[in-house]
Interface confidence: low
């Protein structure tokens, strides 16, 4: 089909365009170009016979015209009147006619832009400024950037004016930024030069350094005040309410008693017409005074507290020292000391931070230290211990509990049997106990500081025969290499004696293997694969003997270096591939597989059907044990050779 | 046994940012490009993109460009979706999904791995 | 991008008839000897479910009544005969490029 394409389609006033012609049919007559959609004679641009190859201009020839014998057009030095559409008539020998249509547009070359504003000098959160990007250009788009960024979304910043006009409301001193706006349209684009816009504020509040208010007689007083403010502020001293001298810096040397007072710094800026004024209290001691420590929080809670402790007073130019426990300060992320080192700060107060806590001051002769000061840090009550730790007591023995948690203010105790209320003791005793004692002995300890309250339950058994003892562990699933394990044989019962068992022969004698607690407890160290035995404990008294179940351990191991069987690597071309990956792990390891890097599936068996040469590679077994959080891999190459060409290749799977 | 399941609010204002996280189980994302598709009521599904969970490699579909940013937790076998400036058209629900975790051949995106689909709704 | 048309949108068939639905790329998905067309089912509230990956080859654990086929631009996918079980809606999915999904195809039990 006949097609015409406008190259460029956007054309800039001034340059060219080439009307291409494409699937221009064979054996023509001629051609002709028109202006618009249609053939129209009054319109006509230009034909051609290619017989004569003789080109005639028509009506609507600009001498800017020219045409190919391809039937292609160039018009050159276009102007903004050309624009539109572009037909091409084509006559065929056979005197049938076929007509395409082209269009393109035309658009001026924009002049470089500039940015105009209303507001010269805004001033903070009073004006509003516009900035309008000249010249108004028709079917032009205006953009604007701030600080070579685009424009950040702001309430207080609107477009209007079809984007020609960015207006800030409410101006603020972060809105003195480098502005530019840019223009654009299909054949060009062009930006502005920078506007800084300068927005006049403050003065802030000022603010008096140094912060010290404390000095001592025959110092030098120097202090300085600053305010921000655009343009920048001006600055009176008064002192106790009489100005004393329109500078930034007030310096008085050599002070004595006589200094002490209120200054006070006024700043003023003469754009805003706005005055800020900010007073310091001085005091001048005559020596230095015997130093004493404030603290923040005289009675922290421990773990969730910080404490202040200040060292007074505040005196300029003085060396602040602190001792803890009689000792300098102790290295811990846990104290931190203000720059001045007149502020010691405990973060997350323990109950091991009572101290004592002195500080001193150093001066020309010697320290004068203050007097100790003790945090008494609230704590508790911790998890409360029942002793003595037996559960398991014979009829007609008495029954003696004590019950202890460490606290501040120190634990008040509550017995319960079996949930009832017995009495409010650290102390439980019961006289002449029976098997009716049996329960479960609850000892509560309770803060009233706090108000925190803990318990402990314990099981107390009272019988004439010994009970089916169990195991318990403290770790089900030990790691192979790594992990220790202890059994303990329950329950801990007065004038007993405790054996173990493993695959029901007695203990063998092993560094690894530890008897502990009145052999009550085995201790395993580094476990490995072989200790996944059957373990069984017994115990026996005078009366009666008795044996627990037995508790398999279950070792996690692996995952070991995999194998991928078969082991042959060359293969011939058609024939299956059939991998399998086998590594010795607890539990079984994920296996997955990756062909020159790139992963398959999560498979132990690897199978591609009718390998090819395009399959050569390295196949790599990954496997992973969670439990362990270890890995293992292997790579094996395979080569594939094309039939027939390799004597004594494996046929596959 | 293997699964992905997709967790984030039900209910997103026009505007804001729609954020759901995929968290996979019985496989390790690393070894997989991890996919969101959607699919809006009564309409057919629409792939969002893909994000390679081993190095944070992405890349979106052209609808999409601009506003969808996909992230990756490895330590957690999670990744999570954020598509900014919603309006009522993206109320749809929203699938993770994995491909080719069964099958023996491998390829570039099938899906044979989904979630079970997260409705979220965009209205004020 | 890749445009995929699938037809028809819906249709009605019987218990044991055989069902065909169609997919035409825009423009080839076949390159180094596959052909990158699946085909899922997706039932009411639920997840799609892949029935067919590279045109032709049936996903493990799918009833083999389920079966695909073509190349280059053009795709089919049939059931050879329809189960109650079938009623769903079944999307063609592409993969040569950036992965699309066809419009769906509504499968209705007369």
């Known amino acids: 089909k006949l097609t015409i394409e406008s190259t460029p389609f956007n054309v800039a006033e001034g340059k060219e365009v080439l009307l291409l012609v494409h699937n221009l049919p064979q054996h023509l007559f001629g051609y002709s170009w028109y202006k618009g959609e249609r053939v129209d004679g009054n319109r006509q641009i230009i034909g051609y016979v290619i017989g004569t190859q003789q080109a005639t201009p028509g009506p609507a020839y600009s001498g800017r015209e020219i045409i190919y014998p391809n039937a292609s057009l160039l018009i050159q030095n276009i102007i903004q009147n050309d624009t539109g559409f572009y037909t091409l008539h084509v006559i065929k020998s056979d005197l049938v006619n076929e007509e395409a249509t082209g269009q393109f547009r035309v658009y001026p070359e924009l002049p470089k832009p500039s940015i105009s504003s209303n507001n010269s000098k805004p001033v903070e959160d009073k004006d509003a400024v516009a900035f309008t990007c000249e010249p108004e250009t028709q079917d032009a788009t205006y953009l604007w950037w701030v600080n070579n960024q685009s424009l950040p979304v702001s309430p207080r910043l609107q477009l209007s004016n079809g984007n020609r006009t960015l207006t800030l409301f409410n101006v603020t001193r972060n809105d003195t930024a480098s502005y530019k706006c840019e223009t654009q349209n299909p054949v060009s684009a062009r930006r502005s030069d920078s506007v800084i816009l300068n927005v006049l504020y403050g003065p802030d509040a000022p603010t008096i350094s140094p912060l010290n208010t404390s000095y001592r007689s025959g110092e030098n007083l120097n202090l300085s005040c600053h305010a921000a403010s655009n343009p920048p502020a001006q600055y009176s001293w008064f002192v106790n309410g009489t100005f004393q001298q329109s500078t930034q810096e007030l310096f008085i040397p050599n002070i004595t008693v006589n200094n002490s007072g209120s200054y006070t710094c006024q700043a003023h800026n003469s754009d805003t017409g706005l005055n800020r004024t900010t007073v310091t209290t001085i005091t001048v001691y005559a020596e230095p005074p015997k130093p004493f420590i404030t603290s923040n929080n005289s009675n922290p809670v421990e773990d969730e507290d910080a404490v202040a402790l200040t060292c007074e007073p505040e005196i300029q130019n003085t060396t602040y020292l602190w001792w803890v426990n009689n000792q300098s300060l102790p290295v811990s992320p846990r104290l931190q000391l203000s720059n001045d080192n007149r502020t010691l700060t405990l973060l997350s107060v323990t109950r091991n931070d009572v101290g004592p806590y002195e500080c001193g001051i150093q001066n020309e002769l010697s320290v004068d230290h203050s007097d100790p000061v003790i945090l008494n840090v609230l704590y508790g009550p911790d998890d409360p211990t029942i002793s003595p730790s037996y559960t398991y007591y014979r009829p007609g023995v008495n029954l003696s509990l004590s019950c202890h948690a460490a606290s501040n203010p120190p634990a008040q105790y509550s017995w319960l049997i079996d949930g009832n209320i017995q009495q409010h003791t650290q102390e439980l005793f019961i006289s002449n106990i029976t098997e009716k004692n049996s329960g479960l002995y609850t000892c509560q300890a309770n803060n009233s500081a706090s108000g925190h309250s803990r318990t402990t339950v314990k099981t107390i058994t009272v019988s004439a025969e010994l009970p089916k003892p169990s195991i318990s562990s403290n770790n089900s699933k030990p790691v192979e290499d790594k992990d220790a394990v202890a059994f303990t044989c329950e329950p801990e019962a007065q004038n007993t004696t405790y054996l173990w068992w493993v695959n029901g022969q007695s203990l063998p004698v092993s560094p690894r293997l530890q008897l502990s607690n009145g052999n009550r407890t085995l201790t395993l160290f580094n476990v490995t694969r072989n200790d996944a035995r059957a373990y069984v404990c017994g115990i026996q008294n005078s009366v009666s003997a008795n044996r627990s179940d037995p508790v398999t351990l279950d070792v996690l191991y692996g995952p070991d270096t995999p194998i991928i069987s078969p082991p042959d690597s060359s293969y011939l071309s058609g024939a299956n591939l059939n991998l399998s990956c086998h590594s010795a792990s607890n539990p079984s390891p994920q296996y997955s597989w990756r062909i020159n890097g790139i992963p398959q599936q999560h498979t132990q068996v690897l199978f591609i059907a009718k390998i090819t040469p395009n399959n050569n590679g390295t196949y790599a077994c990954f496997v992973s044990n969670l439990a362990t959080g270890r890995n293992n891999s292997i790579v094996k190459s395979i080569t594939v050779s094309a039939s027939g060409t390799s004597p004594g290749l494996s046929a596959g799977a | 046994q293997v699964q992905l399941q997709e967790s984030g609010p039900g209910l997103v204002r026009p505007s804001q940012t729609l954020s759901l996280t995929c968290t996979a189980s019985?496989?390790?994302?690393?070894?997989?490009?991890m996919h969101w598709v959607r699919q809006p009521p009564g309409r057919g599904l629409e792939w969002i993109g893909w994000i390679d969970p081993e190095n944070g490699d992405t890349e979106y579909a052209p609808k999409f460009q601009g506003r969808v940013t996909m992230l990756v937790d490895t330590s957690k076998n999670q990744f999570s979706l954020r598509l900014s400036s919603v309006t009522a058209a993206d109320t749809a629900v929203y699938y993770c999904?994995?491909?080719?975790?069964?099958?023996?051949?491998?390829?570039?995106?099938?899906?044979?791995?989904w979630g079970q689909g997260s409705l979220v709704t965009v209205s004020s | 991008d890749i445009q995929m048309t699938q037809s028809p949108s819906s249709l009605s068939a019987s218990v044991g008839d055989r069902v065909t639905i169609t997919c035409r790329a825009s423009?080839?998905?076949?390159?180094?000897?596959?052909?990158?067309m699946h085909w899922y089912q997706q039932t009411p509230g639920k997840a799609p479910k892949l029935l067919i990956y590279l045109a032709s080859n049936l996903q493990s654990g799918v009833p083999s009544r389920f079966s695909g086929s073509g190349s280059g631009t053009d795709y089919t996918f049939t059931i050879s005969s329809l189960q109650p079980e079938d009623i769903a809606t079944y999307y063609c999915?592409?993969?040569?490029?950036?992965?699309?999904f066809g419009q769906g195809t509504k499968l209705q039990i007369t």
């Open positions: 019985g496989f390790n994302i690393k070894d997989y490009y």
């Open positions: 999904n994995t491909r080719g975790l069964s099958t023996m051949i491998t390829t570039r995106w099938f899906f044979d791995v």
């Open positions: 999915q592409h993969s040569r490029e950036l992965p699309t």
């Open positions: 423009k080839s998905v076949s390159a180094s000897g596959y052909s990158y």
